[in-house]
């Protein structure tokens, strides 16, 4: 009886694992083995595929074969008993194109209201992704173990921190990798769960903002308690993509070590042009807070997007706000040659209920105010281009009292 060729050969490549699966064409014939040959592009001869010779099952692994993953190859398979079947040729393929990204490795660390996630590729020193190691981005799904309501976080790098969690709560997450340059989305890691710690006595500093004054950067933050000392650290933002890099070390800003106020001032020349991350920590001498949320600090943007200056004309029932260009040292106005929008926040001095107005124009009327009432106003500029999406810090608040009734002219 003639042996039939095997059919329906599938090539599965996950990271550096090359697996072949196929169907027997004749289940009734026992003791059949299967063998594969491969052929590289531009070659006439077929070579025996090591790891896939005289296989009794319908699966084999040819990961040990050192292939150029960007080069097209062709496979063929035949069945063998006393005689052999004809060869069945598999459509040629390029390993890199066919490859899937495997599940990444995930390591979690818990804080009281945050989880630090360390992500690394599932296959160390992968040949398949050797040229793309730094191009991986990751996405994750996280949920409270008790509720199961999922939140998705896209486009993160190999070190990521999720904030605003609840203390003493178990969270579960799974992570997958993507190579957006090659339109490849990987498979999810196993689910990892971790319980956040008991709430820390000292909360982390909040609302960190950087502004420019003269030739200095001014870093400000909010803190709940008085009589604290603070330290500020920085890191090159690109290192988030590559935490294996030996340079991945947070560094102190010399003028911001053990400061007693909720701000510190340091010269602009501390940082060369670039994008940095900044974080702040509080201490009372005995206890230390966790680090604040990291803020991104772009020296280029910081230098060019300054808070607007404005003045207020007060009437009985309204404010007229006139927004001008920000001033540099020497009181010269800064020329900002890209379209801006202005966010104007105001509130009644006796209340903390803020209102927000967004305008492109530089003269804004805030109507329907109460006479003889103190209102406070602050403003900041945003680039109109949503892709650039940059913002200045807020100007200092200016407070004014509305006039008595009937002065609306």
């Amino acid at each position: 009886k003639n042996l039939k060729s095997p059919q329906k050969v599938e090539v599965d490549i996950i990271d550096d694992n090359f697996i072949l699966r196929w169907n027997r064409s004749d289940e009734s014939v026992g003791n059949v083995t299967f063998s594969f040959d491969y052929q590289k592009t531009g070659m006439d001869n077929w070579i025996k595929l090591s790891g896939c010779q005289n296989i009794t099952s319908t699966k084999c692994n040819f990961s040990s074969l050192k292939l150029n993953v960007y080069e097209e190859i062709k496979l063929r398979i035949r069945a063998e008993k006393e005689n052999t079947s004809s060869w069945y040729e598999v459509d040629s393929f390029t390993p890199f194109r066919k490859a899937q990204i495997g599940p990444p490795e995930v390591h979690l660390e818990a804080e009281d209201k945050a989880i630090v996630i360390h992500i690394s590729p599932g296959t160390k020193d992968s040949v398949m992704w050797a040229l793309d190691g730094l191009s991986f981005t990751y996405s994750l799904v996280i949920w409270k173990n008790s509720s199961g309501v999922e939140e998705r976080i896209e486009n993160i790098y190999s070190r990521h921190k999720i904030y605003k969690l609840s203390p003493e709560t178990t969270y579960c997450l799974k992570v997958k990798a993507a190579l957006l340059t090659s339109w490849k989305i990987g498979v999810y890691s196993p689910v990892h769960c971790i319980k956040t710690t008991v709430e820390n006595e000292l909360p982390p500093p909040e609302n960190i903002e950087v502004s420019v004054q003269n030739q200095n950067y001014v870093l400000k933050w909010d803190y709940t308690y008085a009589n604290m000392t603070f330290q500020v650290q920085w890191l090159h933002a690109f290192l988030k993509r590559n935490p294996g890099n030996h340079l991945y070390k947070w560094k102190q800003i010399p003028d911001c070590e053990n400061v007693k106020t909720t701000q510190c001032v340091f010269p602009q020349n501390v940082f060369q042009k670039g994008i940095y991350l900044l974080r702040v920590q509080a201490s009372d001498g005995n206890n230390t807070s966790f680090w604040s949320e990291e803020i991104k600090f772009d020296t280029e943007i910081q230098a060019f997007l300054l808070p607007p200056v404005f003045n207020i004309r007060s009437l009985s029932d309204s404010f007229h706000i006139y927004i001008g260009a920000p001033k540099q040292s020497g009181n010269t106005p800064v020329i900002q040659d890209y379209p801006l929008i202005y966010e104007i926040i105001f509130w009644e001095n006796t209340s903390n209920a803020e209102r927000k107005i967004i305008e492109k124009k530089t003269d804004v009327t805030v109507p329907n105010l109460k006479p003889l009432t103190v209102y406070c106003v602050k403003a900041r500029a945003h680039t109109m281009d949503e892709k650039l999406n940059k913002s200045s810090v807020f100007s200092d608040a200016v407070c004014e009292k509305t006039k008595p009734g009937n002065t609306s002219k």
């Epitope: 929008i341 966010e343 009644e348 209340s351 209920a353 209102r355 927000k356 107005i357 967004i358 305008e359 492109k360 124009k361 009327t365 805030v366 109507p367 329907n368 105010l369 945003h382 109109m384 949503e386 999406n389």
Partner: nanobody
């Protein structure tokens, strides 16, 4: 603060209609111009702008996927914005959110997304 209350969501057969309402209640004072709009979101996807209207100019914006089927309108006296949805399709199934920005000069889906106050949402389900 600004509070938004959506209503009018529900289940409907493909080809049917629904009218969503969003009432904007602002304590302390009212700004003369608002930009109000509707977004929708399905699980795991980003919120997408559906329609927006400027109370100052009456100018409107529509996403390509709803043009000719959805109409946004306003009742300034009631500080309410409506979304009339006709010829509904299964792919219109989503949570619909109302958003408002206090602005007379900047009324786009981007403005609402970046700076808007948001409502809690109302579910719209269209079955085939």
């Amino acid at each position: 603060q600004v509070q938004l209350q959506e209503s009018g969501g529900g289940s409907v057969q493909a080809g049917g209609s629904l009218r969503l309402s969003c009432a904007c209640e602002a304590s302390r004072y009212t700004y003369s111009s608002n930009c109000m709009g509707w977004f929708r979101q399905t699980p795991g996807k980003e919120r997408e702008g559906v329609a927006a209207i400027s109370t100052a100019s009456g100018s409107t914006y529509y996403a390509d996927s709803v043009k000719g089927r959805f109409t946004i309108s306003q009742d300034n006296a009631k500080n309410t914005v409506y979304l009339q949805m006709n010829s509904l399709k299964p792919e219109d199934t989503a949570m619909y959110y109302c958003a408002v920005v206090e602005s007379s000069t900047y009324c786009t889906p981007d403005a609402l997304k970046r700076f808007g106050y948001w409502g809690q949402g109302t579910q719209v389900t269209v079955s085939s």
